[in-house]
């Protein structure tokens, strides 16, 4: 019968007696940087080419006994998970292996760098189809390793890496912390985060998604037909590398940004029990388990968006946090969040010719996060319109006045320390969907975009009594681009998007009391692109 | 033993090819930074990745590496260039004493230097 992990990533449409999806990644080459491998194992023979690249440190310990099957164990298993004939994800994908880990599974940052350079040079000498690079390894945070990954990604290579097995914030490790890399955490058959002894899968904002990583059956280097079960974020990353190979084989022109957005879009949502993660990491960790798309084509009509969290600003009075989108993505909205509720909002600003989302800490605050909503919107022309504090009782407003521009997000930023305690702010009048409204002492920023066929609408959900969380979701066929709280009162901790739902968090009910101050409204801006829909219909 | 001779030969050549009066200060306004792994047991002191500024050509990378060797030799230190990077990042991998970091950070074209560290199968 089909192993649990392959069943989990397979949409119901494909589920038969066995896992045999169409076109198993045959147009894609997957590079594996790992241990040596047993490439003549029946699972992978003819599928994996062992390159002559080897850069490994000597094994530790004078009594270390180099046993070939142990040296090959990790890499052989992962090659099997990616492309194995019986237990592989992308059975048609061809692989190339580079040895950067020794028989104890240990390597160096420098050896990995030289390996990545080798791949880039190979790509230049003999350009092939789409390339996926699997990095099932982790070390401490490394500026140079992250930089090399960034360069390779910008050369059109898809890099997939293990989040790490340290039950820790993945941002403290490399290459997991590199924004250009697809970073994968591990879940088990119950869709729970994987525990590995006293440790387990890493988590946090640097993780893009999770994938099966416990009790994964794959090729064993003990014999040429043996199988073994292994666990770890390497196994999870191998699943995503396989899924990426399948997607790229179906659509070879996909960019890294498009691939990442699709991986997120087609993942199973909200199935992981977040209680396993430390409390402060839950909101930052994506609740996504990777899956193959239900059909290889026809996803192009969708407007894809994802949420990108910044690093924590730190607690100083003037501290700020910045969230950035990938080069091919548009920043359609910007919000902020602070656990203490002490923040001074957020604004979209230009940096190096690109919009970024900056959140501002407030005096006495423990720090803030900036939250960017990053979307794929071809031929988009976006700008930010700002209205300074109005000082009038009706509050501050700003709208998209340019012809053909629609509102995709609202941000507000204020200089005063305790916004909203002076006078209860008013709700904005109905029937004006193309404008942002905020507190009279705040400056308001509207993200206004023009793109072929783009249409947006505002959806609100208000709760009169205080509540820790207010949500509003976009309906089927619409994508959440903007998420904010109306009207931005002091007890609002912030707003952020989780998949297609806008979440507004407030201070604990017990501390706020049930005054008119308690009224909270979550405002979602939902968009769709008729242009993308038409384009995909024409293709079909 | 052979290795050491090789190093010595390389150093002598480097010394002969370098002029004594070369500027040791980096370009104005920018200070190169040093980075190392926050996890102490994973550090690999003695091996460093010297990363050069983005538009540095291979020939400049090689020249900077030779200059480091020559200046180190003048101070009585043996160094070994293990690899010259090009294609992804400009720079080089050098085996040297940590005492030379201050010197290396002042070399022209240097963006930052990172001490090598371990990575592990996950």
């Amino acid at each position: 019968s089909i192993p649990w992990n392959l069943e989990r990533i397979t949409p119901p449409r494909y589920r038969a007696d066995e896992y045999q999806p169409p076109d198993g990644g045959s147009l894609v080459e997957v590079y594996l940087l790992d241990t040596s491998i047993q490439s003549d194992h029946r699972e992978i023979e003819g599928r994996v080419m062992v390159t002559d690249f080897e850069n490994v440190p000597e094994e530790d310990g004078t009594r270390f006994h180099r046993q070939a099957s142990k040296c090959d164990s990790h890499g052989t298993h992962l090659a099997g998970v990616v492309s194995g004939r019986d237990a592989g994800v992308a059975k048609g994908a061809s692989m190339r292996s580079l040895r950067v880990l020794n028989c104890q599974g240990k390597g160096t940052v420098s050896g990995t760098l030289i390996g990545l350079e080798f791949i880039r040079k190979s790509q230049l000498v003999q350009p092939v189809g789409p390339l996926v690079v699997l990095l099932p390894l982790a070390g401490g945070y490394s500026r140079v390793l992250n930089a090399a990954c960034q360069r390779l990604a910008r050369a059109g290579v898809v890099l997939v890496t293990a989040a790490g097995n340290f039950r820790d914030d993945a941002c403290l490790y490399s290459p997991a912390s590199a924004p250009e890399v697809i970073t994968v955490g591990a879940t088990n058959a119950q869709d729970q985060p994987v525990t590995l002894g006293t440790l387990g899968t890493n988590f946090g904002r640097c993780v893009d998604l999770f994938a099966p990583g416990e009790d994964i059956i794959g090729a064993s280097s003990d014999c040429s037909t043996c199988f073994v079960s292994q666990s770890g974020t390497s196994q999870a990353a191998a699943h995503v590398a396989g899924i990426a190979a399948m997607m790229l084989s179906a659509e070879p022109e996909l960019t890294l940004a498009e691939l990442r957005q699709r991986l997120i879009h087609f993942s199973a949502k909200d199935v992981i029990n977040e209680a396993w993660f430390p409390e402060d990491q839950r909101v930052l960790t994506p609740n996504l388990v990777a899956a193959l798309p239900p059909s290889t084509h026809g996803a192009g009509w969708q407007l894809f968006c994802r949420t990108v969290w910044s690093a924590h600003s730190g607690p100083t009075r003037m501290a700020t946090a910045v969230a950035r989108c990938a080069p091919d993505e548009e920043l359609l909205s910007c919000s902020s969040f602070s656990r203490s509720g002490k923040r001074r909002g957020e604004r979209m600003e230009a940096q190096g010719g690109k919009l970024v989302c900056r959140a501002h800490n407030a005096f006495g605050g423990e720090g803030v996060y900036a939250i960017a909503r990053c979307c794929l919107l071809p031929q988009a022309n976006c700008s930010v319109h700002t209205a300074p504090p109005a000082e009038a009782s009706m509050g501050t407003r700003v709208h998209c006045h340019q012809q053909g521009h629609v509102l995709t997000g609202c941000s507000s930023h204020w200089e005063v320390e305790d916004l909203g305690t002076h006078k209860p702010p008013v709700l904005r009048p109905r029937g004006q969907p193309n404008q942002c409204v905020g507190h009279r002492e705040a400056s308001i920023h509207a993200s206004c975009c023009h793109a072929p066929g783009l249409e947006c609408k505002v959806k609100e959900h208000g709760i009169p009594a205080p509540q820790e969380q207010v949500t509003v979701a976009c309906e089927e066929g619409w994508t959440l681009t903007g998420c904010s709280a109306l009207p931005g009162t002091s007890h609002v901790l912030g707003a952020y998007a989780v998949d297609n739902t806008c979440v507004v968090r407030s201070r604990d009910v017990s501390t706020t009391g049930s005054t008119s101050e308690g009224a909270v409204t979550a405002v979602a801006i939902c968009c769709r692109s008729r242009h993308l829909a038409q384009a995909s219909q024409e293709l079909q | 033993q052979e290795d050491e001779d090789g190093d010595y030969e390389e150093l002598v050549l480097a010394l002969r090819s370098e002029e004594d009066g070369l500027a040791e200060a980096p370009e104005h306004g920018t200070t190169a930074t040093f980075h190392r792994c926050a996890k102490d047991p994973w550090r690999l002191p003695g091996t460093y990745v010297v990363v050069l500024k983005e538009e540095t050509h291979l020939s400049q990378s090689e020249r900077t590496a030779r200059r480091l060797q020559a200046q180190a030799a003048r101070r009585g230190y043996l160094t070994k260039i293990l690899h010259v990077f090009h294609g992804l990042l400009p720079g080089f991998l050098v085996k040297m004493s940590g005492d030379l970091l201050e010197l290396a950070l002042k070399l022209p074209h240097v963006d930052y230097i990172e001490e090598d560290s371990s990575v592990f199968a996950q």
Epitope: D17, D40, R42, E45, G46, V50, S224 | -
Partner: antibody
Framework: QVQLVQSGAEVKKPGASVKVSCKAS????????ISWVRQAPGQGLEWMGW????????NYAQKLQGRGTMTTDPSTSTAYMELRSLRSDDTAVYYC????????WGQGTTVTVSS | DIQMTQSPSSLSASVGDRVTITCRAS??????LDWYQQKPGKAPKLLIY???TRPSGVPSRFSGSGSGTDFTLTISSLQPEDFATYYC?????????FGQGTKVEIK
């Protein structure tokens, strides 16, 4: 191009041993093992086992256990199949083929066991 | 071991004919079935692997289908060079096992 070249025909007496060689070329040896298949006169094909160029590991058919040995010499890119205690029913054409997939075959070596 | 049964054991056909050979496995082998062609005095040649995939260089008149236990090799238009013996082989389990062969003769 990818090819497997086998040693010449052998005539052996019952009880003797035979060692057939198979020289591989045109591909990366470590990526595939070598399968051995035999075909008795007028009969079908029978898989005998597999041997690795990479680490010398073997996988024998049960019928062969104890009587046959498969080895490789990566330095000469050659695989060997030795069969001991030959019987008349071992008379067959012995083929080597690339890997478990058996996508490339040697030309065959005829082994005749006769008193 | 998995038993493979081919039918017919021999058949006579003319050039241009459409020829179908079937192979049945004693248990499910998913799609792990290969077809070989063997001419007298020659080594077998791989025609189809994984039930339906043709290696490069094999003419398109050869096609394979089936999954589970029942498989078919079809020659859409028999050519003079196609007169040979055809073997199916399961690749699901070790040991790989072959069918007894189907001899395609000139009518």
């Amino acid at each position: 191009q990818v090819q497997l070249v086998q040693s010449g025909a052998e005539v052996k007496k019952p009880g003797a041993s035979v060692k057939v060689s198979c020289k591989a070329s045109g591909y990366t040896l470590n990526n595939y093992g070598i399968s051995w298949v035999r075909q008795a006169p007028g009969q079908g094909l029978e898989w005998m086992g597999w041997v690795s160029f990479y680490n010398g590991n073997t996988n024998y058919a049960q019928k062969l256990q104890g009587r046959g040995t498969m080895t490789t010499d990566p330095s000469t890119s050659t695989a060997y199949m030795e069969l001991r205690s030959l019987r008349s029913d071992d008379t067959a054409v012995y083929y080597c083929a690339r890997g478990y997939v058996m996508d490339i075959w040697g030309q065959g070596t005829t082994v005749t066991v006769s008193s | 071991d998995i038993q493979m049964t081919q039918s017919p054991s021999s058949l006579s056909a003319s050039v241009g004919d459409r020829v179908t050979i079937t192979c049945r496995a004693s248990q499910s082998i998913n799609n792990w079935l290969d077809w070989y062609q063997q001419k007298p005095g020659k080594a077998p040649k791989l025609l189809i692997y994984a039930a339906s995939t043709r290696p490069s260089g094999v003419p398109s008149r050869f096609s394979g289908s089936g999954s589970g236990t029942d498989f078919t090799l079809t020659i859409s238009s028999l050519q003079p060079e196609d007169f040979a013996t055809y073997y199916c082989q399961q690749d699901q389990d070790i040991p790989p096992t072959f069918g007894q062969g189907t001899k395609v003769e000139i009518k």
